[in-house]
């Protein structure tokens, strides 16, 4: 019996508007009906929560209104989008999946996605 595996891309480049999207996919060892997905940012040895959402299988996942994350779910796959990123937010973003219900609980953690954010150059003033 293998432990739950979570897959996510190694590298993603954020758009010029500071938006990064990636897929978090998990191989479930059980028939979960309630799943929690958390995005964590690891900088040095510090891990902080970026956003989290709980969803019922078959339903959409909903982040809090003030969250910088949005996402959609399809089976054991979650499409995550993080918005409002700046160059200083470049770092390793880890997808954590928890099978919350029914018992038993299972934990799965991805290896992380390195998100690179480049702040856009300000437009030079035009002389007409």
């Amino acid at each position: 019996c293998k432990a739950m595996h979570v897959a996510q891309p190694a590298v993603v480049l954020a758009s010029s508007r500071g938006i990064a999207s990636f897929v978090c996919e998990y191989a479930s060892p059980g028939k979960a009906t309630e799943v929690r997905v958390t995005v964590l940012r690891q900088a040095d040895s510090q891990v902080t929560e970026v956003c989290a959402a709980t969803y019922m299988m078959g339903n959409e996942l909903t982040f809090l209104d003030d969250s910088i994350c949005t996402g959609t779910s399809s089976g054991n796959q979650v499409n995550l989008t993080i918005q409002g990123l700046r160059a200083m937010d470049t770092g390793l973003y880890i997808c954590k999946v928890e099978l919350m219900y029914p018992p038993p609980y299972y934990l799965g953690i991805g290896n992380g996605t390195q998100i690179y954010v480049i702040d856009p150059e300000p437009c030079p003033d035009s002389d007409f």
Epitope: C1, A3, T48, E98, Y101, P104, L107
Partner: antibody, heavy 119, light 107 residues
Framework: QVQLVESGGGVVQPGRSLRLSCAAS????????MHWVRQAPGKGLEWVAV????????HYADSVKGRFTISRDNSKNTLYLQMNSLRAEDTAVYYC????????????WGQGTLVAVSS | DIQMTQSPSSLSASVGDRVTITCRAS??????LNWYQQKPGKAPKLLIY???SLQSGVPSRFSGSGSGTDFTLTISSLQPEDFATYYC?????????FGPGTKVDIK
Amino acid sequence: QVQLVESGGGVVQPGRSLRLSCAASGFTFSSYGMHWVRQAPGKGLEWVAVIWYDGNNKHYADSVKGRFTISRDNSKNTLYLQMNSLRAEDTAVYYCARGDILTGYYSYWGQGTLVAVSS
Amino acid sequence: DIQMTQSPSSLSASVGDRVTITCRASQSISSYLNWYQQKPGKAPKLLIYAASSLQSGVPSRFSGSGSGTDFTLTISSLQPEDFATYYCQQSYSTPFTFGPGTKVDIK
């Protein structure tokens, strides 16, 4: 800094009830799974129960299922363990512990509170 | 439920000795394995998390290895303050079981 302080332990007769509390401070309480772990005199560590985040999901060890109830009040940063139908084998030091945000390990523990079930 | 076993259950060693404790899970737990040290009358203290990561403030003589079902805690050079009981614990699936412990005492 992170602090966990248990209270509510004491001597109780078999079949009676007791409620333990764990006051947490120094971190965002609602972002963490909170656990109870116990240790009978001269024995090893035994995981008792966990309550997740918003309090909707709880899991228990078979030895306490149906008798113990874990709960939390995120507005008060407090974790509880309601223990009913107590038995002599429930005699132990009870610790609350914070599950880490990444892989759930216990980097923070309370000092422990002793529950003695005796007639 | 996932069962955790530890060996040996106790060992006698001298200051400066290299000590190895093994922990085995009844099924794969990936790297969700933690090691704790406990001294009499005290709460346990985290040493190693995620099988091989050293907890902040823990001396580098402690190290952990393994993945799947077999794990090891090594103390490279035993110090007087290391005489204690050591527990492994899995944080992969409920119930979050502990191993029975390994008591390290003075030879």
